[in-house]
Interface confidence: medium
């Protein structure tokens, strides 16, 4: 058949939906691959065709739009399931074509099961709340377009397995859940169950997200260098190994890039001829403050190396800091017998 621009399997858009719930899936062509929208395509005489490949099969087959109660239907650029079944899992393809043009993309759809406490293999979005920051809200995600604005759904919120009612600092307000003052104890999975009627049937939408309480911008400080510091002197003899850790604390800052680097005599270690290695490790606190450690290592230090300046630098959105390590050569202990002998004129 004629050539078709095939965008392949778009694994970036791994779509997961719950079993026995409505799902509306937009054709990704118009969102991510083409420069025009569905309306433009439709008015230009292009047709959108859907087909699928079942899980563990190679055969592409058309989607059956003649199921009882219109269980699967298409509306403009949206594929509807009312509701999904477990065996709807597979790779779905939407193809836009006319006699002279063709473009298609496939994407994986996984129908997942949940238990009575909403546990499932679903990848959960993470919503970050600032600790002790005043009122903050989360909104029940991905429910737009399922019912018209004239329909008033009922929304029930859960934390883990428990319905949220009479909680100290968490208040359900329809599609929103308000945290009066977020604390570490508010970390967890929150689920909204949206129930709405349609054509004499009742449908449920379940949406779970993870709330992570993080450091507040009110408490954020520029990077703090714990080591090197004024309390520690790196006193070495030539031939010994020199190990200097640079340990830096970074306050949590949304979308901030935290950087730590060493300079030796004002240059990056890569730009000098010393045989130096640097190993980095990163750890996080409960509020996602970060501690980065970079260990500078010179296996066999020379007396020249011990005269150099070793400076640890750190940078975040809050500022840049630097601290020099105190490095010096060990003074050998005097050899008293020889010196005393010389003093007495011995030869």
């Amino acid at each position: 058949s004629e050539r078709c621009d095939d965008w392949g399997l778009d694994t970036m858009r791994q779509i997961q939906v719950f079993e026995d719930e409505p799902a509306r899936i937009k054709c990704p062509l118009f969102e991510h691959f083409l420069k025009f929208n569905y309306s433009t395509a439709h008015s230009a005489g292009l047709t959108l065709i859907w087909y699928w490949t079942r899980q563990d099969r190679d055969l592409e087959e058309p989607i059956n739009f003649r199921l009882p109660e219109n269980r699967i239907s298409k509306e403009k650029d949206v594929l509807w399931f009312r509701p999904t079944l477990l065996n709807d899992t597979g790779n779905y393809t939407c193809m836009l074509r006319n006699t002279t043009y063709c473009s298609k993309v496939a994407f994986p759809l996984e129908v997942v099961q949940k238990d009575s406490c909403f546990n499932s293999p679903m990848k959960l979005p993470v919503h970050k709340l600032y600790i002790e920051y005043g009122i903050q809200r989360i909104t029940c995600p991905n429910v737009d377009g399922y019912f018209p604005s004239s329909v008033k759904p009922t929304i029930t919120w859960y934390m883990g397995c428990y319905k949220i009612q009479n909680f100290n600092n968490v208040i359900p307000e329809g599609m929103n859940l308000s945290f009066l003052i977020a604390l570490i104890s508010n970390n967890g999975n929150y689920t909204c169950v949206v129930t709405y009627p349609e054509n004499g049937r009742t449908f449920h939408l379940t949406r779970t997200l993870t709330v992570k309480v993080v450091g507040s911008p009110k408490n954020a400080v520029p990077p703090v260098i714990h080591s090197p510091n004024d309390h520690v002197v790196y006193e070495k003899e030539p031939g010994e190994e020199l190990l200097i850790p640079c340990t830096v604390y970074f306050s949590f800052l949304m979308d901030s890039r935290n950087e730590v680097w060493w300079t030796i005599d004002g240059k990056k270690p890569d730009d000098i001829t010393i045989d130096v290695t640097i190993n980095e490790s990163i750890s996080h606190s409960r509020t996602e403050d970060e501690t980065r450690t970079q260990i500078l290592s010179i296996k066999k230090v020379t007396s020249e190396d011990l005269k150099r300046s070793y400076v640890c630098h750190a940078r975040s959105a809050k500022g840049e800091v630097a601290k020099a390590a105190k490095v010096k050569q060990k003074v050998p202990a005097p050899r008293y017998t020889v010196e005393l002998a010389c003093g007495f004129g011995a030869t």
Epitope: V221, V224, H226, S227, N229, H231, V232, V233, Y234, E235, L243, I244, P245, T247, Y249, S251, S281, D289, T291, T293, I295
Partner: antibody, heavy 123, light 112 residues
Framework: QVQLVQSGAEVKKPGASVKLSCKAS????????MNWVRQAPGQGLEWVGQ????????YYAQKFQGRATLTVDTSTSTAYMELSSLRSEDTAVYYC????????????????WGQGTLLTVSS | DIQLTQSPSSLSASVGDRATITCRAS??????????MHWYQQKPGKAPKLLIK???DLESGVPSRFSGSGSGTDFTLTISSVQPEDFATYYC??????????FGQGTKLEIK
């Protein structure tokens, strides 16, 4: 996970010396101060001193200056405390304890402890 | 050197009671934003265990019935509802400045 495993009980005579060990695992040994704390039978906790393994920098409580020596072997992630000129009042359980890191320079808490080594000094 | 004085030296409580231990430093162990005061629990024959660091920061894994407060020279450890496993000795500890750390003399929490 972080673990500090200390050497076994010791019995020494007055005037002798003893060297206790503390093997660390589960974290980057050289980047945390290691402290030694002792506890005489039925008494409270008493800080002996601390060492920064990366550099060998040490600090001692005045009482132990000159009598306690803290060292480390970074290749085996082991800290040592040697106590010389032992006397009967040195009979105690000796703990090694790691300091945590905090956002501010200055005081650190002792977040992980070894199981303790009982030193008995008796003639 | 900074001295720490804990009170009371022993405390009797029943399961479910609220227990409060105080620790007074001979000079301030606080600066803007934090205090170098920590609390430990020790059971007979065991190593101390960190409960609260920097006056009020609950150590990971420690039950939320433990809380700490205070700044400057006066600090408090509170157990909101004493449980059977809480009967132990509690120590305050300051780490203000290098190189001297000191501990309070301890408070023994006993069953009433």
């Amino acid at each position: 996970q972080v673990q500090l495993v200390q050497s076994g009980a010791e019995v020494k005579k007055p005037g002798a010396s003893v060297k206790l060990s503390c093997k660390a695992s589960g974290y980057i040994f050289i980047t945390y101060w290691m402290n030694w704390v002792r506890q005489a039978p039925g008494q409270g906790l008493e800080w002996v001193g601390q060492i920064f393994p990366a550099s060998g920098t040490t600090y001692y409580a005045q009482k132990f200056q000159g009598r306690a020596t803290l060292t480390v072997d970074t290749s085996t992630s082991t800290a040592y405390m040697e106590l010389s000129s032992l006397r009967s009042e040195d009979t105690a359980v000796y703990y090694c304890a790691r300091t945590d890191f905090y956002r501010y320079d200055g005081g650190y808490a002792l977040d992980y402890w070894g199981q303790g080594t009982l030193l008995t000094v008796s003639s | 050197d900074i001295q720490l004085t804990q009170s009371p030296s022993s405390l009797s409580a029943s399961v479910g009671d609220r227990a409060t231990i105080t620790c007074r430093a001979s000079q301030s162990v606080s600066t803007s934003g934090y205090s170098s005061m920590h609390w430990y629990q020790q059971k007979p024959g065991k190593a101390p265990k960190l409960l609260i660091k920097y006056a009020s920061d609950l150590e990971s894994g420690v039950p939320s019935r433990f809380s700490g407060s205070g700044s400057g020279t006066d600090f408090t450890l509170t157990i909101s509802s004493v449980q059977p496993e809480d009967f132990a000795t509690y120590y305050c500890h300051h780490s203000w400045g290098i190189p001297m750390y000191t501990f309070g003399q301890g408070t023994k929490l006993e069953i009433k």
